[in-house]
């Protein structure tokens, strides 16, 4: 079983955290925009 076949669990964790961070930033931005437009 070659290491290259898999993305290891830490790499997957880091990607998940990056996605979470990105979504939080995008959603936060949208929320601020909505409040501003009211």
């Amino acid at each position: 079983h070659s290491d290259g076949i898999f993305t290891d669990s830490y790499s997957r964790y880091r990607k998940q955290m990056a996605v979470k961070k990105y979504l939080a930033a995008v959603l936060g931005k949208r929320y601020k925009q909505r409040v501003k437009n009211k």
């Epitope: 290891d8 669990s9 830490y10 964790y13």
Partner: antibody, heavy 116, light 112 residues
Framework: SVEESGGRLVTPGTPLTLTCTAS????????MIWVRQAPGEGLEYIGF??????NTYYASWAKGRFTISKTSTTVDLKITSPTTEDTATYFC?????????????WGQGTLVTVSS | DIVMTQTPASVSGAVGGTVTIKCQAS??????LSWYQQKPGQPPKLLIY???TLASGVPSRFSGSGFGTEFTLTISGVQCDDAATYYC??????????????FGGGTEVVVK
């Protein structure tokens, strides 16, 4: 390198905070774990902190008994209410950079003795 | 939490001989397992990670194999300096297993 400090003799129920200090490395890039070893016993995993985002996770038995936190240069382990069973040498270790490649960098450990 | 079971608890090996230590995980951890050597009064030393990759500076007489739930550490051509306690550790972290990285109970290697 990493170095643990703060171990001493405490009476049961007295909170104690241990500190893991990193020299020459940026802690924010690594996963850090705390492990303990009672005299003559094996290694017991306590928990870890992702020093980048501050997320913490604990072994089931350790939840509520320990708190892991970080500053820019240290990772701390608080023993919330020590009992005599918490007498052990406490180690911190650094992932490389995460956990999947094992933990290559260990401190020498700090001894905690809980006794009345 | 994942449980790591190591066998035997103690093993004796002759200088130049071969010693084999087994580690079993309670669920699949793919190839994310490491092995450590610990001598009295010292912290653990990483020997092998990803089940079979030798850590930096570790002699080639140490080798690891396995995948899923069954793993083996082999010391070929045992030397006196190899007398120590050896531990396996789960390094497979997921939300489902709460990112917990337990150790096996340890195997003491006595060199004759």
């Amino acid at each position: 390198s990493v170095e643990e400090s703060g171990g001493r003799l405490v009476t049961p129920g007295t909170p104690l905070t241990l500190t893991c200090t990193a020299s020459g490395i940026d802690l924010s890039s690594y996963a850090m774990i705390w492990v303990r070893q009672a005299p003559g016993e094996g290694l017991e995993y306590i928990g870890f902190i992702d020093a980048g985002d501050g997320n913490t996770y604990y072994a089931s038995w350790a939840k509520g008994r320990f708190t892991i936190s970080k500053t820019s240069t240290t990772v701390d382990l608080k023993i919330t209410s020590p009992t005599t069973e918490d007498t052990a040498t406490y180690f911190c270790a650094r992932g490389d950079p995460g956990w999947s490649n094992g933990f290559a960098l260990w401190g020498q450990g700090t001894l905690v003795t809980v006794s009345s | 939490d994942i449980v790591m079971t190591q066998t035997p608890a103690s093993v004796s090996g002759a200088v130049g001989g071969t010693v084999t230590i087994k580690c079993q995980a309670s669920q699949s951890i793919r190839n994310e397992l490491s092995w450590y050597q610990q001598k009295p009064g010292q912290p653990p030393k990483l020997l092998i990670y990803k089940a079979s990759t030798l850590a930096s500076g570790v002699p080639s007489r140490f080798s690891g194999s396995g995948f899923g739930t069954e793993f083996t550490l082999t010391i070929s051509g045992v030397q006196c300096d190899d007398a120590a306690t050896y531990y396996c550790q789960n390094n497979y972290g997921t939300r489902r297993n709460n990112y917990v990285f337990p150790f096996g109970g340890g195997t003491e290697v006595v060199v004759k």
